[in-house]
Amino acid sequence: SERCDDWGLDTMRQIQVFEDEPARIKCPLFEHFLKFNYSTAHSAGLTLIWYWTRQDRDLEEPINFRLPENRISKEKDVLWFRPTLLNDTGNYTCMLRNTTYCSKVAFPLEVVQKDSCFNSPMKLPVHKLYIEYGIQRITCPNVDGYFPSSVKPTITWYMGCYKIQNFNNVIPEGMNLSFLIALISNNGNYTCVVTYPENGRTFHLTRTLTVKVVGSPKNAVPPVIHSPNDHVVYEKEPGEELLIPCTVYFSFLMDSRNEVWWTIDGKKPDDITIDVTINESISHSRTEDETRTQILSIKKVTSEDLKRSYVCHARSAKGEVAKAAKVKQKVPAPRYTVELACGFGAT
C-alpha cells in the first residue's frame, strides 16, 4: 500500500474511561495534527477508518461495528462505546485516506474500573479554589456531546464516598457545584454522576476531579525575605565555611513563577571565580504558599570573600525584593602574652 503520514502513538492523549460507561473519543488527527476539520475532509472525499491493537498484542485489527445494540459505533470523527468493556483497552488508530492521501495517528485507550467510592487509577484533573472567596463553582467535566439538549439528565454530586446533601457550604446546582466561602476542609475528590436515558437504556457518566483550596489573591503580598536580615551577622575567620541562608516566603499566586537568586558583588555566582555552591529547598503550606530557601556556601572563605556584598533577591508576579547579608571578618581574640601585656604597660 502507498505511503501514509504516520504520526505514531500519541501518548500525550492517554485516554482513560470507566468500564461500563459510554465513551466518545474524537479522532486526534483533526484536533492536533491536521489543519482542517472532519467536515472539510469528508467533503473532499476522504474516508476515516478506525482500527485497534488489543492490549499486549501486536496485531492491528479492524473494530467490530456489528456488535449487539451497536455497542461500538462511529459518528463523523467520533468513536462511540455504549458502553465500554474492560477488554476494550488497547491502542486505537484513526486513519484518514483516499487514493492519493493518507494520514494516521494512534492513541492509547485505557478502560479502568472504579470502586463504590469512585476510587480508581484514573488521573484526576485538579481544580483550584481560592480560600474564603464568596462563590466559586466547579462544573461536571467532559459530558458535552453525550446526549441532546432536549434530554434532561439527573446529576448527583459526591464528596469522596458521600452524597452531597445539606453540606453547609457546598451546594449542588445541576451540572455545577458551588462552594461558598471555601475552606481547606473543602479539599478532596468530588464526583458527579450524570444519568441519562437513550433508546430505552439508562447510561451513567462518572467524572471525578480533585479540589484544592489555595491562597487567595486578596491576601497575596510581594515576596517576604525572612533571611538574611538585620539581626544576624555572619562573622567568619578566613578558612572557615561561610553558610548564608536566603529564606523567602511567596504568597500563592496562580501561574506565578517564583524566583530566588543570590548575587555576589552584583554578579550571579556562575559569573564569578569563587568556589561557591547554592542548594535550594522548597516547602509549601496547606494553601500552597511557598517558602524557598537557597543556602549559599563557600567552603573555605578568604578575607577577600568576607569583604564582598552578598545579596538575596526574590521575584514573583507581585513584585521583586532584595536583602543584603551582613558579612564581616571576625576579629581574632587577643593573645594575652603580647597584646594584653602591652596594653597593661608591660615591657
Partner: antibody, heavy 118, light 107 residues
C-alpha cells in the same frame, strides 16, 4: 485601631423584624470576611452567619436559615443582619466579628442586645 | 456539624497556680482551633489561633497545644485578670462551632 460597633438591637415581639448594623473602622472592611455570633443570656457562643469579603458568599446556622439575611456595604464599611420572623429563642447579645481563615475571629464588637418577647 | 466539648465546666484555681483547660472535637479539625476569653459584660477576646499561636498582645503565660481532636489551653500562672470564661472554637468546617465554655474561678 480596629473597631467594630454594633447597633440596632432592642425589644421586638415574636414574629417581628429587626435590622442590626455593625460599623467597622481602622481596617478596610472589603478585605475581610465578617460574621455574626450570638450569646443567649447566661449561655455560650453560637455562630449565626458569615459573609465573604465581596458579599457574594453567605452562610447561615440551621437555626436561622430562611429567616436571617446577612449583607454588607463595603463603601460604607458596614455589615448588616436582617432578622425576620423572630422567635423568643433568638433573644441574645449579637456580636459582629471579623474573620480570616488563618486567625478565626480576631476582632469582635461590644455586642447589641436583641430581646424577643411579647 | 462538628461538636466541641470542653472540660471541666468550672475550674477553681488559686492565683499564681497553673490552669489546664481541655477541648475535644467530635471529628478532626486539624490545627484550626481558636481559644477565646470572655469576661462578664464584655465581648470575647481572641487568645490563641491555629491551636498554638498566641494572638497579638496576648501574654506568654497563655499557651495552646494539640491537633486533630484533642486540644489544651494552659495558663501557666493565673493572674487576677485571667478569671473568666474560656471558649474553644473550630474553624475547620462550616458551620464554625464553639465549645460550651469553661469558667475559671478563684479558689
Amino acid at each position: 485601631e480596629v473597631q467594630l460597633l454594633e447597633s440596632g438591637g432592642g425589644l421586638v415581639q415574636p414574629g417581628g423584624s429587626l435590622r442590626l448594623s455593625c460599623a467597622a473602622s481602622g481596617f478596610p472592611l472589603s478585605n475581610y470576611g465578617m460574621s455574626w455570633v450570638r450569646q443567649a443570656p447566661g449561655k455560650g457562643l453560637e455562630w449565626v452567619s458569615a459573609i465573604s469579603y465581596d458579599g457574594e458568599g453567605t452562610l447561615y446556622a440551621d437555626s436561622v436559615k430562611g429567616r436571617f439575611t446577612i449583607s454588607r456595604d463595603n463603601s460604607k464599611n458596614t455589615l448588616y443582619l436582617q432578622m425576620n420572623s423572630l422567635r423568643a429563642e433568638d433573644t441574645a447579645v449579637y456580636y459582629c466579628a471579623r474573620f480570616r481563615y488563618y486567625t478565626a475571629f480576631d476582632y469582635w464588637g461590644q455586642g447589641t442586645l436583641v430581646t424577643v418577647s411579647s | 456539624e462538628i461538636v466541641m466539648t470542653q472540660s471541666p465546666a468550672t475550674l477553681s484555681v488559686s492565683p499564681g497556680e497553673r490552669a489546664t483547660l481541655s477541648c475535644r472535637a467530635s471529628q478532626s479539625v486539624s490545627s484550626n482551633l481558636a481559644w477565646y476569653q470572655q469576661k462578664p459584660g464584655q465581648a470575647p477576646r481572641l487568645l490563641i489561633y491555629g491551636a498554638s499561636t498566641r494572638a497579638t498582645g496576648i501574654p506568654a503565660r497563655f499557651s495552646g497545644s494539640g491537633s486533630g481532636t484533642e486540644f489544651t489551653l494552659t495558663i501557666s500562672s493565673l493572674q487576677s485578670e485571667d478569671f473568666a470564661v474560656y471558649y474553644c472554637q473550630q474553624y475547620n468546617n462550616w458551620p464554625w462551632t464553639f465549645g460550651q465554655g469553661t469558667k475559671v474561678e478563684i479558689k
